[in-house]
């Protein structure tokens, strides 16, 4: 028999610092967690003790904090290097800065593989990204080869700016022809590896003949056996098994997410590649592993940088920007629509010639808008200013729901009007009219949404039955403020951007803003 | 665009030297394990040299060991075969491999190679 350890991250999304337990920014360094300097620590660690091990990374390396904003994918280069990875599939968020934006400071500075098996150029794109991704990854372990494929979620066209010259076929379809292709060059140990949410992860165990582990990420999935360390509840148990279609026992794993763990499983092959066994947990990467001196050392000279960044206009606004809790809570406030336009800017795809856009609705939580923004400043928006409105360190998520769902997350909106509670939403492409004169749960007397599928947008009624993709906060995908019906009953939730970058990013590209409160939100009383 | 490709093949006497060349574009070469494999008439292709990709760590098939000495300059993005004592037997296609992998230790496996050249025929006659 031959024991692989495979150590394992994904949706790490920036954190190259240490963080606090929510992945958030990092107050209490006793109590801080994760961080690529105490990962290396860890990873070191496991290196020296076992002779077998791969370190491997599910996708979606980039967005998510200040670091990304800045540096643009070249510290995710830099430290990826530094801790050694050996292989990388291509998450979604790599393209969040279109094609140019993975290929320059990613594709080309990694000493690491970076896998898709699914993605095809086409057009002139084909011969310039050629080679600089691959399908497959033949890595000699040992005295044995491991083959890595990876895949990349075919939603990514929705979700982030990959061009019209990459084709993203179906992951199954696409890894079958690479995984026989492996078993014809003798290698018997593959490894899926790949960005495409835990649903598919077992789809390609169950239906991939010839993948004996799946490694995955995208939905943050945390699976544990035992008590669990922290606060993620587990999805299942780890390594979860799946059987594969032609009766094998196929463990497939994903680490949660931000660096907060560090995936180990160790598989035991026999003489053929077959696995016999495979066990592990996810490692809670906490304070009591120190961070590495030297990547501690690294890390700081790269902050510099940002520190500088944090204070350096993004644009200017010739409005005050009221993001006060009196109003947010209370009655749509022009921060919440400025907020909403540039969550629809962000996910603005071209990609069906029927549709205008694919999304058009936004909504948001006035409990989340925590500051104003004075014009009196000369106008100047920076983003520390932005990190003051939105300082939870968030993402702004697309999730698909039922017109039905969106009904009943209105009227929580206003169950407890008057209370100054966080739950108020504001939104963008829709019109709502409450009555509060009426009984909670039965508030909402006009609910219209902009249309999608039209060449000129215009506002129609909310049909109860009808799906509808949305763009909210990962704090109201996740059941937050009451909104458990948003939780329950959600059809599809794709994790989006860091909240202060689509922000920033949008008051940068229009460079002068001045939203008005413009009628989104109305009240009234009496017949309809 | 990854592209590797040899040059520098050629008609030699037996005993005689040559020097093949190797470029590769499209990411810095600094990025690659880079290996030389042959592959003769009829025969399997076969694993000649390898270098890592500091240039610090190399590696030799037993049968052109002490003759062939394979080098790197990654400011040029070029890899290098020099061949002395040249035998009969070295005549072959040589090829020029790059294996894009976050280690040191280059591998004389040709499965691990990622990106190959088109090749140069290199005959030595007696």
């Known amino acids: 028999a031959w024991e692989l350890t495979i150590l394992h991250t994904n949706d790490v999304h920036s954190r190259l610092e240490q963080t606090s337990e929510d992945s958030s920014k990092c107050v209490n360094a006793s109590r801080c967690m994760g961080g690529v300097a105490r990962l290396f620590t860890k990873v070191q660690q496991i290196r020296r003790a076992e002779p077998n091990v791969l370190l491997l990374d599910a996708g979606d390396q980039y967005q998510g904090t200040i670091w990304f904003t800045v540096y643009k994918g070249a510290e995710v280069a830099h430290f990826m290097n530094a801790l050694r990875y050996d292989a990388m599939a291509l998450g979604n968020h790599e393209f969040d800065n279109g094609v140019e934006g993975l290929i320059e400071p990613l594709l080309k500075e990694a000493k690491f593989p970076i896998l898709s098996a699914n993605i095809k150029a086409k057009g002139p794109l084909a011969s310039q990204i050629s080679g600089l991704y691959l399908p497959y990854k033949v890595l000699p372990v040992g005295d044995e080869v491991v083959g890595i494929v990876g895949y990349t979620s075919k939603e990514t066209p929705f979700l982030s700016n990959p061009g019209t010259n990459l084709v993203f076929e179906d992951e199954i379809t696409a890894l079958q022809p690479e995984v026989d292709k492996l078993k014809t060059l003798n290698v018997n140990k593959i490894i899926a590896l790949g960005h495409s949410g835990f649903e598919m992860d077992k789809l390609i165990a169950q239906k991939v003949r010839g993948v004996d582990v799946v490694v995955g990420g995208h939905s943050n999935t945390f699976l544990y056996t035992g008590n669990p360390p922290s606060k993620e509840v587990p999805a299942g148990k780890y390594p979860f098994i799946v059987t594969s279609d032609d009766g094998r026992k196929v463990p497939v794993v994903q680490a949660y997410a931000f660096g907060k763990y560090l995936g180990y499983l160790k598989i035991e092959f026999d003489e053929r590649g077959n696995v016999i066994s495979s066990h592990g947990n996810p490692i809670l990467l906490n304070s009591s592993i120190p961070e590495d001196p030297s990547i501690k050392a690294d890390i700081n000279k790269w902050r510099i940088k940002l520190d500088n960044y944090s204070t350096q206009e993004l644009g200017k606004t010739i409005v005050y920007l009221d993001g006060s809790s009196q109003s947010c809570r209370f009655r749509e406030c022009n921060m919440g629509n400025l907020i909403c336009d540039a969550m629809i800017n962000n996910n603005l795809r071209h990609t069906d010639e029927m549709f205008w856009n694919h999304v058009s609705m936004c909504i948001l939580n006035g409990g989340g808008i925590r500051s104003p923004i004075d014009e009196r400043n000369n106008g100047t928006i920076t983003w520390e200013n932005l990190a003051a409105v939105l300082p939870f360190g968030g993402t702004f998520d697309l999730v698909q729901l039922k017109g039905s769902t969106l009904k009943k997350a209105f009227e929580h909106s206003v169950h407890r009007y008057g209370q100054s509670t966080g739950e108020f939403l504001q939104v963008g492409g829709i019109h709502v009219v409450y009555d509060l004169s009426r009984k909670p749960g039965d508030r909402v007397v006009k609910l219209d949404v902009l249309c999608t599928k039209c060449r000129v947008p215009s506002y129609d009624p909310l049909k109860m039955d009808e799906v509808y993709k949305v763009i909210l906060p990962n704090f109201l995908a996740n059941g937050g403020d009451g909104f458990q019906m948003i939780k329950d009953e959600l059809l599809r939730h794709d994790s989006g951007d860091q909240d202060i970058n689509v922000v920033s990013t949008y008051i940068s590209k229009m460079k002068v803003i001045y939203p008005a409160v413009e009628g989104r939100i109305k009240f009234s009383t009496g017949s309809h | 665009q990854v592209q590797v490709q040899e040059s520098g093949g050629g008609l030699v006497q037996a005993g005689d030297s040559l020097r093949l060349s190797c470029a590769a574009s499209g990411r810095s070469i600094s990025r690659y394990n880079m290996g030389w494999f042959r592959q003769a008439p009829g025969k399997e292709r076969e694993f000649v040299a390898a270098i890592s990709r500091s240039g610090g760590v190399t590696y030799y098939a037993d049968s052109v060991k002490g003759r062939l000495t394979i080098s790197r300059d990654n400011a040029k993005s070029a890899v290098y075969l020099q061949m002395n004592s040249l035998k009969p037997e070295d005549t072959a296609v040589y090829y020029c491999?790059?294996?894009?992998?976050?280690?040191?230790?280059?591998?004389?496996?040709?499965?691990?190679?990622?990106?190959w050249g088109q090749g140069t025929q290199v005959t030595v006659s007696s």
């Open positions: 491999a790059a294996d894009w992998r976050n280690s040191d230790s280059p591998s004389p496996l040709i499965i691990v190679y990622d990106y």
